[in-house]
């Protein structure tokens, strides 16, 4: 649903996008994800900030918490207890890393309309959650875990060894948060709240990254983070489970690590409860091509957890690393022993498999030269998943239902024909037992969220259709977008091209390549966006291209694992190849080609600029990695192995940006980094700058004091304004 193209007579009433539009978020869209609390009910915060319960079956809506109550403690978030008696209100949000934050929590009794007094929660809390049944509370405070049977009860302290930057209980350390769990928590309730499992991370021996935080004081603070870089000592992880009904009885019981994993450095990758007395743990060797899924059972007689070897399932990759970005997690079926899981099939495509006894005997559920991406829900008779199968576009996502109750299983695409032009990239959110579900369509047209019946797939209502956005865009000259592919030497390079509104193939345009290119990423997606590059096409008349080269995801293992142990080679080659093909199309001014990227994209853009091809006039690297020896162990070693002589040290050294300093002499280079980047440390850009200075190569640079990897707030405006000036100057466009 892009606003319709208009005739020339109307074009004078239409305007181009401005940089201000982008920085103000004028054309941002809304999505609607129901906060499901049962099979047919969800909570949603209304426009006036009341918390409202919607019942799909009865058609009724009930305000359960008033905006007045929310405002009384400045709450920015809430969480309802499963017994519906209490709600936690979250305030004083203080961001830590990507997912983690601390907050103050208040417990409100919905039945009597009062805050729970007595035995109040300490502050600030690192993580808090309700049990899945009733209203028990588990929380993490100062790296220790506490349990409350009821909100007003005194807490029971589960762990005692928590220590800042040393021992983390129930929350991950930096590297596990960013590179393994992708959550702020490391504790998991069993389905009925009988047991609580948690991870303990010991960071005692991990080297510490230290950087200055300038703040406003006379002396800067030093931020210290245990951060294992490639090859360094890693955190040591243990998993414990405690009976929350009688927590003092035997205390936390450690879950044993599979012998084949424990024999050398390893990671814990995820925990999935199957029943109250069965749990599934996933482990990974430090050399991340072997993963073990271990199913453990509670032994009532010994009050311990037993993980028999017969319930260990090994997943191994011979061509790359295990899994995609992460090793996939299992979705268990109702028999509580068999499960569905996505992993590579014999042809090297990620597909859903059904594992009943052994991985070797797995039954393949989906197949084809496309990939299954996520399993949303398994019910008694259906499995819902997403894939990029439809019409062979890897950058699309549709939701499918496979009937598992009947044989042979039948497959139905739930979304493929709903709003075919507007919606080609979906995700979904399911209620209990998949009684109902919400579909969230991200594009390519204006996003729309809808509610559906889980049995019939009938659309019940539109939850959010972004009408205001649609109206706002009616007088905007948006760029045209096209997604196509290049076939080069048996490699398919999908690309997205963003073209100026009055694009004319007979004219020549400056070209900007936007690159990310990291392993298992995907940039060419059929999604809606009005962002900086939209502005550059709409107002400044640039052509922008995004290319998914080798190492990118969802097109099979051949493309994905091509970069294994060789980061920084093929990703760059494929961007260059694509640029040459774009030049051949005839509408690119080959004297005005630029490349830019952020993070991994900054690394690729830097290497592309330093490739010596003469293709690029200028480029920008924002917060780039410059050497893989500087980046996190978990991420880096997954793709590069270890930086040791007997492993892959040679390529670690060959693939640095610094090694190519001389090649920057004939390009205009803008290097940008936040000084408080906890993720890709400022060290990376400092070393590039040092190498360029030592090589006597001129370049431009901008640092953002006290900013992290996201360069947020006012820095964002400054950043995009600065980059715009740089590009316009490079392309000789008047200001």
């Amino acid at each position: 649903l892009r606003p319709p193209r208009v005739h020339n007579s109307e074009e004078n009433t239409m305007r181009a996008l401005t940089l201000k539009d982008i920085l103000n978020g004028t054309f941002s869209y809304k999505t609607f994800f129901p906060n499901w609390i049962s099979g047919q009910e969800y909570l949603h915060q209304s426009a006036d900030n009341n918390i409202v319960l919607y019942n799909i079956e009865t058609g009724q809506s009930y305000t359960i918490l008033s905006n007045r109550t929310m405002k009384s403690v400045n709450a920015s978030n809430y969480g309802l207890s499963p017994d519906r008696q209490f709600v936690y209100l979250e305030s004083d949000y203080s961001k830590l890393w990507r997912y983690s934050y601390t907050a103050t929590y208040y417990i409100y009794d919905l039945s009597n309309g009062e805050f729970v007094r007595g035995n109040e929660l300490p502050r600030p809390i690192q993580y808090l959650c309700w049990s899945p049944v009733g209203s028990k509370l588990a929380y993490v405070y100062q790296n220790n875990i506490y349990l409350k049977q009821r909100p007003g009860d005194p807490p029971f302290q589960i762990t005692f060894n928590g220590r800042e930057n040393k021992i983390f209980n129930g929350i991950p350390d930096w590297v596990y948060e960013e590179e393994m769990l992708a959550t702020k928590y490391a504790l998991w309730w069993s389905p009925n709240g009988k047991f609580l499992a948690y991870a303990e991370f010991n960071d005692t021996d991990i080297p510490v990254i230290a950087y200055s935080y300038y703040g406003d004081e006379q002396y800067p603070r030093t931020i210290n983070i245990p951060y294992p870089k490639a090859g360094a000592k890693n955190p040591f992880v243990r998993i414990f489970i405690i009976d929350t009904t009688y927590p003092a009885y035997v205390g936390p019981q450690e879950v044993p690590v599979p012998a084949m994993i424990a024999s050398s450095d390893y990671y814990f990758s995820w925990l999935t409860w199957v029943t109250d007395e069965r749990v599934c743990l996933q482990w990974l060797k430090r050399v991340q091509n072997v993963s073990v899924l271990s199913i453990c059972d509670f032994r009532e007689d010994w009050q311990t957890w037993d993980c028999p070897k017969t319930q260990e399932h090994i997943e191994e990759s011979r061509t790359g690393w295990a899994g995609g970005f992460f090793v996939s997690t299992p979705v268990f079926s109702y028999d509580a022993i068999s499960y569905y899981k996505i992993f590579s099939d014999k042809d090297g495509y990620k597909h859903i498999h059904y594992i009943k006894d052994t991985v070797e005997n797995a039954i393949q559920i989906t197949s084809g030269k496309w990939e299954a991406i996520n399993i949303f829900r398994v019910t008694q008779d259906s499995l819902f998943y997403s894939s990029n199968e439809f019409e062979d576009y890897p950058g699309r996502r549709n939701i499918y239902r496979i009937s598992i109750g009947s044989y042979p299983p039948s497959k139905k695409c739930v979304t493929c024909h709903l709003r075919k032009e507007r919606c080609q990239y979906y995700t979904a959110s399911f209620s209990d037992y998949a009684k109902y579900y919400a579909l969230v369509c991200y594009g390519p047209g204006i996003p729309i969220s809808t509610l559906h019946d889980g049995r019939t797939d009938q659309e019940i209502k539109i939850l959010e259709e972004n009408k205001e956005l649609e109206n706002a865009l009616k007088n905007i000259q948006l760029p045209k977008e096209e997604i196509k592919k290049l076939e080069v030497d048996e490699i398919t390079l999908w690309y997205k091209m963003i073209l100026p509104p009055q694009f004319d193939r007979s004219k020549k345009y400056p070209l900007l390549i936007q690159v990310y290119g990291g392993p298992c990423s995907q940039s060419v997606r059929s999604v809606f966006a009005v962002n900086w590059i939209s502005y550059l096409a709409s107002k400044e008349g640039m052509v922008i291209a995004l290319v998914d080269g080798r190492g990118t995801a969802f097109q099979g293992d051949k493309l994905l694992y091509a970069v294994y142990r060789k980061l920084g080679v093929y990703e760059v080659e494929d961007q260059i190849t694509a640029v040459r093909k774009f030049i051949e199309m005839g509408f690119i001014d080959e004297k005005r080609i630029a490349i830019w990227g952020w993070s991994y994209g900054g690394y690729v853009s830097s290497l592309a600029l330093a490739s010596g091809t003469g293709l690029f006039k200028c480029g920008i690297a924002v917060a780039p990695v410059s050497s893989w020896e500087y980046y996190a162990s978990v991420y880096t070693e997954r793709f590069m192995g270890l930086p040791t002589k007997d492993d892959n040290l040679e390529h670690y050294k060959n693939s640095t940006v610094m090694a190519r300093a001389e090649y920057f002499r004939n390009v205009d280079y803008l290097l940008i980094h936040g000084t408080a980047d906890d993720n890709v440390h400022f060290q990376n850009s400092a070393q590039i700058a040092k190498a360029l200075v030592n090589a006597q190569v001129d370049f431009q640079a901008m640092w953002y004091s006290d900013q992290n990897h996201g360069l947020s707030g006012l820095s964002t405006n400054h950043l995009y304004t600065h980059m715009t000036h740089f590009l316009k100057q490079c392309f000789s466009l008047s200001d």
């Epitope: 319960l53 305000t63 359960i64 918490l65 008033s66 109550t69 519906r84 039945s111 009597n112």
Partner: antibody, heavy 120, light 107 residues
Framework: EVQLVESGGGLVKPGGSLRLSCVAS????????MNWVRQAPGKGLEWVGH??????????DYAAPVKGRFTISRDDSKNTLYLHMNSLKTEDTAVYFC???????????WGQGTLVTVSS | DIQMTQSPSSLSASVGDRVTITCRAS??????FNWYQQKPGKAPKLLIY???GLQSGVPSRFSGSGSGTDFTLTISSLQPEDFATYYC?????????FGQGTNLEIK
């Protein structure tokens, strides 16, 4: 502690009117959906009607026997629920209870009831 | 309107007995169904919500089951204080009708 206290019952002639009150305490009255339920002497419970919270639109629903004759209203500033009864009939004789409809679909708290007798 | 048919209308039993009361809805009400207990001269008291949920403070000898149109209240071992009148109620859609009640008396 949640409390509901009804008042206003008494003897009234057929065709007459009466207003019952229910004062609430111990919970957020303004967000509550409030109900009236009655019980004729020696008989079972009969749902009379309810009023939604103002936040949820404040609309009312009534049982067929009282529709058009009874009106439920509320005054959130006074934490009070009302039942305005007009054109009373002898079959309206009952103990009238006010109760809270909690959003897990139950009448979880009840008042002690007030007796209305319609008799000539 | 949804009709609720409760049976039996009265029941004699002894302390320690297992007692079952049933209720049938005239159309499917899923689990929007509750049981109440009322003693003479008192207001009703919620026992079971959502067909099978035990209200806080209610003894575990009371249990509820059913979904759709047929529902059951079971008292596993009658105690002296359980002799009262029991009502079922649907809360699926207004009017929120009650069953006619079951009077449980001492044999």
């Amino acid at each position: 502690e949640v409390q509901l206290v009804e008042s206003g019952g008494g003897l009234v002639k057929p065709g007459g009117s009466l207003r019952l009150s229910c004062v609430a305490s111990g919970f957020t009255f303004s967000l509550a959906w409030m109900n009236w339920v009655r019980q004729a002497p020696g008989k079972g419970l009969e749902w009379v009607g309810h009023i939604k919270s103002r936040a949820d639109g404040g609309s009312t629903d009534y049982a067929a026997p009282v529709k058009g004759r009874f009106t439920i209203s509320r005054d959130d500033s006074k934490n009070t629920l009302y039942l305005h009864m007009n054109s009373l009939k002898t079959e309206d004789t009952a103990v009238y209870f006010c109760s809270r409809f909690y959003w897990n679909y139950v009448l979880d708290y009840w008042g002690q009831g007030t007796l209305v007798t319609v008799s000539s | 309107d949804i009709q609720m048919t409760q049976s039996p209308s009265s029941l004699s039993a002894s302390v320690g007995d297992r007692v079952t009361i049933t209720c049938r809805a005239s159309q499917s009400i899923n689990s929007y169904f509750n049981w109440y207990q009322q003693k003479p001269g008192k207001a009703p008291k919620l026992l079971i919500y959502a067909a099978s949920g035990l209200q806080s403070g209610v003894p575990s000898r009371f249990s509820g089951s059913g979904s759709g149109t047929d529902f059951t209240l079971t008292i596993s071992s009658l105690q002296p204080e359980d002799f009262a009148t029991y009502y079922c109620q649907q809360s699926y859609s207004p009017p929120y009708t009650f069953g006619q009640g079951t009077n449980l008396e001492i044999k």
